[in-house]
């Protein structure tokens, strides 16, 4: 009953679990047997530049409870949010609130979303109803894309969902891909 | 919206390989996990592989292992499927499928039209 | 590998409720499965109907529902229309890995 509060969008932030904490230990399974070879899929990053990778953004840590209608999962997970604006890295600060956000004065850069992976979670229900268990994609790494003068203000609004939509990861870190229907929301808590 | 749209039919003698294309417009296929399903005439679907997002890698069936190879060309938004030492039971349509853009993971929500691929001596 | 089991052929009245199920030869079916359900029409492509046990999609009918029944995975449908006949698949997931029942053909009898 008490679950009532809990937003239906996914998003419920527990601060209190920590702001870097470990993610959860991965799901066993057994996929060992019948993998393909070489089967990831290679890096692809169409807007990279050279000086683009000499910017960086944050990757900050959330844990949260993921939510699907009343129901809630039984562990919180562990994702990354792309915060804010890209610099070059030595001029970042290396945590929140020390330092100054640089703001380059040429092209603009925005850290969003790269990689994101598939997570399996098991829903507890309240009332009695049934578990659920659902795939939820979560975002796996950030990166700095430079924004063109085709990027209007609307754009950028929604820029973690559409404007970069990332890409499917490859071996050996689990990745998945896909726009996150939340990811701008918690871009703007930043 | 995603749609999917798969290259022509094909005939093969035995032995010969097939590859079969599916263009993705709507998203790019980098944002996608792309599978293949086929079905011999009059029978049920049969899965043949797949990419899997919790670890990054395409996935076979244990009954295609070493015989088909599925690949993709992000630069085309295509996708290709290319199964080797072709049988006459390997007569089927293949469609390619993909799950949908959002915050859970769903597989398998569009579909191509499907390829007929007929091996015949 | 696993293999799904699914009834061959059922029958059902227009109005009527019919209950399609699907086993895995590995044992108790259950949500970490993921059970998908599909419907196939002659001539078309398959279109999903069900994922993740009994998530129905934008384009489902509601007379459409997904459940878990005495160790299987269940498609019921309730009120049947003459276009629900058609091939019925269930498909699971063995972690990444998955494997199709061989199909159900549903006949609206009227």
């Known amino acids: 009953q008490g679950w009532q509060a809990f937003k239906n969008d996914a998003t419920e932030i527990i601060p209190e679990l920590g702001e870097y904490p470990e993610p959860p230990p991965e799901l066993e399974n057994n996929k060992t047997m019948n993998r393909a070879e070489n089967g990831g899929r290679p890096p692809h990053h169409p807007f990279e530049t050279k000086d683009v990778s000499e910017y960086s953004c944050r990757e900050l840590h959330f844990t949260r409870y993921v939510t699907d209608g009343p129901c809630r999962s039984a562990k919180p997970v562990t994702e990354l949010v792309c915060s804010g604006q890209c610099g070059p890295a030595r001029l970042l600060p290396n945590a929140i609130g020390r330092g100054k956000w640089w703001r380059p004065s040429g092209p603009d850069f925005r850290c969003i979303p790269d990689r994101y992976r598939a997570q399996r979670v098991q829903l507890l229900c309240p009332g009695g109803e049934a578990p659920r268990a659902r795939k939820v994609r979560l975002v796996a790494s950030c990166k700095c894309k430079r924004l063109t003068r085709f990027h209007n203000q609307s754009e950028l609004k929604d820029f973690g969902t559409e404007a970069a939509r990332p890409q499917k990861g490859r071996k050996p870190r689990p990745r998945a891909r896909s726009a996150k229907a939340n990811q701008a929301e918690l871009e703007n808590a930043y | 919206e995603v749609q999917l749209v798969q290259s022509g039919a094909e005939v093969k003698k035995p032995g010969a390989s097939v590859k079969v294309s599916c263009k993705v417009s709507?998203?790019?296929?980098?944002?996608?996990?792309m599978h293949w399903v086929r079905q011999a005439p009059g029978k049920g679907l049969e899965w043949m592989g797949g990419?899997?997002?919790?670890?990054?890698?395409?996935i076979y069936a244990q009954k295609f292992q070493g015989r088909v190879t599925m690949t993709e060309d992000t630069s085309t938004d295509t996708a290709y499927m290319e199964l080797s030492s072709l049988r006459s039971e390997d007569t089927a349509v293949y469609y390619c499928?993909?799950?949908?853009?959002?915050?859970?993971?769903?597989?398998?929500?569009?579909w191509g039209q499907g390829t007929l691929v007929t091996v015949s001596s | 590998q696993a293999v799904v089991t699914q009834e061959p052929s059922l029958t059902v009245s227009p109005g009527g409720t019919v209950t399609l199920t699907c086993g895995s030869s590995?044992?108790?079916?259950?949500?970490?499965?993921?059970p998908y359900w599909f419907q196939q029409k002659p001539g078309q492509a398959p279109r999903t109907l069900i994922s993740?046990?009994?998530d129905k999609h934008s384009w489902t009918p509601a007379r459409f529902s997904g459940s878990l029944l005495g160790g299987k995975a269940a498609l019921t449908l309730s009120g049947a229309q003459p276009e629900d006949e058609a091939e019925y698949y269930c498909l699971l997931d063995y972690g990444g890995r998955f494997v199709f029942g061989g199909g159900t053909k549903l006949t609206v009898l009227g």
């Open positions: 993740d046990t009994d």
């Open positions: 499928a993909t799950d949908t853009v959002g915050y859970w993971e769903k597989f398998f929500q569009h």
């Open positions: 590995t044992g108790t079916v259950t949500i970490d499965h993921y």
């Open positions: 990419f899997d997002p919790e670890d990054g890698e395409t």
């Open positions: 709507g998203y790019t296929l980098t944002e996608l996990s």
